[in-house]
Amino acid sequence: EEDGFCQPYRGIACARFIGNRTVYMESLHMQGEIENQITAAFTMIGTSSHLSDKCSQFAIPSLCHYAFPYCDETSSVPKPRDLCRDECEILENVLCQTEYIFARSNPMILMRLKLPNCEDLPQPESPEAANCIRIGIPMADHHHHHH
């Protein structure tokens, strides 16, 4: 059995960012499991004093696109589209710096979802990054052109 499937997003937690677009899942039954994890994480985030407004504004859509990545329509096999590295780095190092420090000391804060690791993402100028999912972090354009 091949690994990886493209299926319509059927959840609620990330519907405002993803709608019913096709997302990549490692296994057929994973969408429901991750939906539960994300719902629980968002509930915790909503009651947390560790999350600033400037962070949550972009961290929440970013987490949604990380947990439920769009399928790469240009690929002949099921393949996820990655977050954009420049946005990931700004989120981690600028907008959510304090939150990331807290989260890194609690590796399973997102339950069975790993914290996004910007180092895993292709470099901005590489061909692999051409189709990355852009959240729309305003500072990312500035960061992208000056590094």
Epitope: E1, G4, M30, K79, P107, K114, E119, L121, P122
Partner: antibody, heavy 120, light 107 residues
Framework: EVQLVESGGGLVQPGGSLRLSCAAS????????IHWVRQAPGKGLEWVGY????????YYADSVKGRFTISADTSKNTAYLQMNSLRAEDTAVYYC?????????????WGQGTLVTVSS | DIQMTQSPSSLSASVGDRVTITCRAS??????VAWYQQKPGKAPKLLIY???FLYSGVPSRFSGSRSGTDFTLTISSLQPEDFATYYC?????????FGQGTKVEIK
């Protein structure tokens, strides 16, 4: 079917080099970490290091740092373990295994292993 | 690095016996512990993940549990094909670390 197949093992002299390959099929390695784990004869499992093929970022065990290099060719869906300055204590069966990049998961698929013998 | 202390290192048992293997983590690893079975000349096979979840295709006689930093693998009724070496592993942080292994032999 998901499969990992190692190759490249053999007999090498101390101080020598060897390159192992881990060919993946049934899944795209860019969505995973590919780990190398070794097992000395009659001993337990020891983690060697891993690569995130998507970006090329790597992590190594202290025992091999500076001597071993992990790389990947995503077009061939294959990861590699380049072993230099080999020592007798590097003698082991070397396995590659995969681990999800997104999810907290153990190593769900392993290769069959390839034996590396370091001896004069 | 997180140490995983596994015990016993070996045990003798008969077919039908209930077998328990334990692993203690040197620090909190939440539920990020897996158990593997390895037979001579073969690669390890995943049995249990996230401390207590049975991996696909693994017989239900295998089960896992957690109590704080103590993790247990139980084989409810040992079968002839279960004689092998068992390893625990934490994958909570890098580097992932393994227990020393428990060899289950025929009495």
């Amino acid at each position: 079917e998901v499969q990992l197949v190692e190759s490249g093992g053999g007999l090498v002299q101390p101080g020598g080099s060897l390159r192992l390959s881990c060919a993946a099929s049934g899944f795209n390695i860019t969505g995973y970490y590919i780990h190398w784990v070794r097992q000395a004869p009659g001993k337990g499992l020891e983690w060697v290091g891993y690569i995130s093929p998507n970006s090329g970022s790597t992590y190594y065990a202290d025992s091999v740092k500076g001597r071993f290099t992990i790389s990947a060719d995503t077009s061939k869906n294959t990861a590699y373990l380049q072993m230099n300055s080999l020592r007798a204590e590097d003698t082991a069966v070397y396995y590659c295994a995969r681990d999800s990049r997104r999810y907290v998961r153990p190593f769900d698929y392993w290769g069959q292993g390839t034996l590396v013998t370091v001896s004069s | 690095d997180i140490q995983m202390t596994q015990s016993p290192s070996s045990l003798s048992a008969s077919v039908g016996d209930r077998v328990t293997i334990t692993c203690r983590a040197s620090q909190d690893v939440n539920t990020a512990v897996a158990w593997y079975q390895q037979k001579p000349g073969k690669a390890p096979k995943l049995l249990i993940y996230s401390a207590s979840f049975l991996y696909s295709g693994v017989p239900s006689r295998f089960s896992g549990s957690r109590s704080g930093t103590d993790f247990t693998l139980t084989i409810s009724s040992l079968q002839p094909e279960d004689f092998a070496t068992y390893y625990c592993q934490q994958h909570y942080t890098t580097p992932p670390t393994f227990g020393q292994g428990t060899k289950v032999e025929i009495k």
